[in-house]
């Protein structure tokens, strides 16, 4: 899959889990740089993937509500992430400076259920992500226009 | 209801370029993907890419890469798709589509009526 | 690229028949994580736009006779009719839906 960054350091993957959806997300950040992220797969946090420090975010995710649109922003290192919903929430973590790629899956319809990267002593050196359809697929309505930040706001 | 107006059809000289739209009603499009199909005189379907209208993202099929550009105006609610340096083997009617409702993912319920390009000196 | 090849290419029928066509792709179509087979099945009449028949494999499209069944898994499909009718002469496509999209060549119905 596609990495964002310039990369180096040792490589860190979430959980492969066929059986559960990506249902929250914990993002640390300290020095403007995005230390580390863990997702919440179902009712269980998988391993927290990066550097340590930082101070944590958590966001939870609404039933039936999935991520599917990523932008990430790296200096060197991670310094910034918002993530876009299915419900069009965003989730904006660290600060938005620096090189912005946005990242989303090709196939319509899919969902982030995976990410990767590499990481040093400082934080995330590159983060890839891992598409794929919902375990369940939704009866989409056209989305409720909801908007909330983890941090600060960001225009859509 | 749900529908998808293709603009008419176009005689173009090899080399030149088009521009095609699909105006949609019945649903705004920025809650759908908007996609385009190809259909070359006598032969099969091929798809050419998609374009998020809400924020403009596009996707297309490598073979496609550099042949056309989908854009999408949501104010007037419409899809476009670009050809450029035409040749013959742009001959072809070219469809808009857009998913049915019931699910997420790409089923192409909906198409418009499609427009003949035909590239001719 | 995932390569769709459908056969045969073109078939004769008798109103009443009941007809075959197959649909198999270069790789597995179906998912691991949804255990879905990414795989639409379209007609597409004379003159007309394509419609949508089945997808998933085997679910039918909302309105559509249930003289048309989709079946097969991973990357042999197969289109059956149960019992032709007039109205069914057309060209029909595979799609797959699991990496970008992919049509086949099509099978074209055709009357004895």
């Known amino acids: 899959g596609k990495m964002y960054g310039p990369g180096g350091g040792k490589y860190f993957s979430t959980t492969e889990d066929y059986d559960h959806e990506i249902t929250g997300l914990r993002v640390s950040v300290g020095l403007l740089l995005v230390k580390s992220v863990q997702v919440k797969l179902g009712d269980s946090w998988d391993v927290k993937l990066g550097a340590l420090g930082g101070n944590t975010q958590e966001v939870t995710l609404q039933p039936g509500e999935y991520i599917t649109k990523v932008f990430v922003a790296f200096q060197a290192f991670l310094r910034g992430m918002v993530m876009y919903t299915s419900k069009d929430r965003y989730f904006y973590f660290g600060k938005l400076d620096g090189q912005i790629s946005s990242a989303y899956p090709s196939q319509e319809g899919q969902v982030l259920v995976g990410i990767y990267g590499q990481y040093q002593l400082l934080g995330i050196k590159s983060i890839g992500f891992e598409w794929n359809y919902p375990l369940e697929e939704p009866t989409t309505e056209p989305p409720v226009n909801l908007t909330y930040s983890a941090n600060s706001p960001v225009g859509r | 209801q749900v529908q998808l107006k293709q603009s008419g059809a176009e005689l173009v000289r090899p080399g030149a370029l088009v521009k095609l739209s699909c105006k949609a009603s019945?649903?705004?499009?920025?809650?759908?993907?908007m996609h385009w199909v190809k259909q070359r005189p006598e032969q099969g379907l091929e798809w050419i890419g998609w374009i998020d209208p809400e924020n403009g993202n596009t996707i297309y099929d490598p073979k496609f890469q550099g042949k056309a550009s989908i854009t999408a105006d949501t104010s007037s609610n419409t899809a476009y798709l670009q050809l450029s340096s035409l040749t013959s083997e742009d001959t072809a009617v070219y469809y808009c589509a857009r998913r049915a409702i019931t699910t997420a993912t790409a089923w192409f319920a909906y198409w418009g009526q499609g427009t003949l390009v035909t590239v001719s000196a | 690229d995932i390569v769709m090849t459908q056969s045969p290419s073109s078939l004769a029928v008798s109103a009443g028949e009941k007809v075959t066509m197959s649909c198999k792709s270069s790789?597995?179509?179906?998912?691991?994580?949804?255990?879905?087979?990414?795989l639409a099945w379209y007609q597409q009449k004379p003159g007309q736009s394509p419609k949508l028949l089945i997808y998933w494999a085997s679910t039918r499209e909302s309105g559509v006779p249930d003289r048309f069944t989709g079946s097969g898994s991973g990357t042999d499909f197969t289109l059956t009719i149960s019992s032709v009718q007039a109205e069914d002469l057309a060209v029909y496509y595979c799609?797959?839906?699991?990496?970008?999209?992919?049509f086949g060549a099509g099978t074209k119905l055709e009357l004895k």
């Open positions: 790789q597995s179509l179906l998912n691991s994580r949804t255990r879905k087979n990414y």
């Open positions: 799609k797959q839906s699991y990496n970008l999209y992919t």
């Open positions: 019945g649903f705004n499009i920025k809650d759908y993907y």
